[in-house]
Interface confidence: medium
């Protein structure tokens, strides 16, 4: 089974190092999820030729995947800690339905897909503890998520492969931007 962050001794800087701070724990958690995504992308790329498709060709999809923008305050220029944290948490909550969709999309990496999903839930909890403005965080409607999930699962095989590839890539990109932003907090 995949090892959760903090359980892998080789990542610890020194034998008698201090316990991880909440920021370090969040940082490590995101990197753990990125490793999981990397493994899932490998299986997707081996299974279909989606990874060779140009970004432009794949952009013409109807998925409304969360994405960072200038107004979210997460970039080096115009950085705003509170606004950015709300965006990261909201984005992760929006990704949850897509991570649920991924659960029966993998054969050899089924455990890895589950680990990514569960780790994301834990990450959201970590970040919610850090956030001051929890009221500004909008949680997606369960009914909306359920109908979206049904719609995605009804797609043909080719579209499902493309959807899987897009979710993994977008989630990777969102986490990479989040990682950079969180290091400024």
């Amino acid at each position: 089974a995949p090892v959760l962050p903090g359980e892998d001794s080789k990542d610890v800087a020194a034998p008698h190092s201090q316990p991880l701070t909440s920021s370090e724990r969040i940082d490590k958690h995101i990197r753990y999820i990125l490793d999981g995504i990397s493994a899932l992308r490998k299986e997707t790329c081996n299974r279909s030729n989606m990874c060779e498709s140009s970004k432009e060709a794949l952009a013409e999809n109807n998925l409304n995947l969360p994405k960072m923008a200038e107004k979210d305050g997460c970039f080096q220029s115009g950085f705003n800690e509170d606004t950015c944290l709300v965006k990261i948490i909201t984005g992760l909550l929006e990704f949850e339905v897509y991570l649920e969709y991924l659960q029966n999309r993998f054969e050899s990496s089924e455990e890895q897909a589950r680990a990514v999903q569960m780790s994301t839930k834990v990450l959201i909890q970590f970040l919610q503890k850090k956030a001051k403005n929890l009221d500004a965080i909008t949680t997606p409607e369960p009914t909306t998520n359920a109908s979206l999930l049904t719609k995605l699962q009804a797609q043909n095989q080719w579209l499902q492969d493309m959807t899987t590839h897009l979710i993994l890539r977008s989630f990777k990109e969102f986490l990479q931007s989040s990682l950079r932003a969180l290091r400024q907090m």
């Epitope: 990542d11 610890v12 800087a13 020194a14 190092s17 990197r31 990125l34 490793d35 995504i37 990397s38 140009s54 970004k55 432009e56 994405k67 960072m68 923008a69 200038e70 997460c74 970039f75 080096q76 220029s77 990777k172 990109e173 990479q176 931007s177 950079r180 290091r183």
Partner: antibody, heavy 120, light 107 residues
Framework: EVQLVQSGGGLIQPGGSLRLSCAAS????????MIWVRQAPGKGLEWVSD????????YYADSVKGRFTMSRDISKNTVYLQMNSLRAEDTGVYYC?????????????WGRGTLVTVSS | DIVMTQSPSTLSASVGDRVTITCRAS??????LAWYQQKPGRAPKVLIY???TLESGVPSRFSGSGSGTDFTLTISSLQPEDFATYYC?????????FGQGTKLEIK
């Protein structure tokens, strides 16, 4: 063939401005993470700035923040480094490069470098 | 900022020798480390990424190891074309930083 062709270096006086260009071929900059690295004469490598394709956000080293601007022109498949208020310590070879598409970032493609000399 | 310290700064060796270059990070960086080779007047070239993964096309005599703060680059049997300067680079967090370099010269 994947390559980066650089231009725009030269001799410039302190306080002056210069724009470096880096034209990519064999891949599209709109879906790649680009970076500038410099090397002072006889010295090691130093990260200058990078541009993350995902949202076009840029990050800069403290030594150049507020003076250098990295940008891109997707239609020309080219990235730029606009350098203002140049100082003697900015002298060196500037490399345009690409981060590999792997979250364990590493530079997999480098330009040949362009020499910038800041001197009066 | 994460400081990367390489040792030795200069290394003299002969063709056929086994050589090891070390790189130490000022804080834990897990496996977020790459090694580059640079020859005079040329751009650097990646050899190893993710601390121990060999870049495609790089000879298998090059290997990398380590995790956390201590890393090594090993060349199992030096070839004439391996005499160059080697740099480590961390990609754990910005500012991305490089080691000061290790110059590998002919003894």
């Amino acid at each position: 063939e994947v390559q980066l062709v650089q231009s725009g270096g030269g001799l410039i006086q302190p306080g002056g401005s210069l724009r470096l260009s880096c034209a990519a071929s064999g891949f599209t900059i709109s879906s790649n993470y680009m970076i500038w690295v410099r090397q002072a004469p006889g010295k090691g490598l130093e990260w200058v700035s990078d541009l993350y394709y995902y949202a076009g956000d840029t990050y800069y080293a403290d030594s150049v923040k507020g003076r250098f601007t990295m940008s891109r022109d997707i239609s020309k498949n080219t990235v730029y480094l606009q350098m203002n208020s140049l100082r003697a310590e900015d002298t060196g070879v500037y490399y345009c490069a690409r981060w590999a598409d792997d979250h364990y970032y590493y530079i997999d493609v480098w330009g040949r470098g362009t020499l910038v000399t800041v001197s009066s | 900022d994460i400081v990367m310290t390489q040792s030795p700064s200069t290394l003299s060796a002969s063709v056929g020798d086994r050589v090891t270059i070390t790189c130490r990070a000022s804080q834990g960086i897990s496996s977020w480390l790459a090694w580059y080779q640079q020859k005079p007047g040329r751009a650097p070239k990646v050899l190893i990424y993710k601390a121990s993964t060999l870049e495609s096309g790089v000879p298998s005599r090059f290997s990398g190891s380590g995790s956390g703060t201590d890393f090594t680059l090993t060349i199992s049997s030096l070839q004439p074309e391996d005499f160059a300067t080697y740099y480590c680079q961390q990609s754990y967090s910005t500012p991305w930083t490089f080691g000061q370099g290790t110059k590998l010269e002919i003894k």
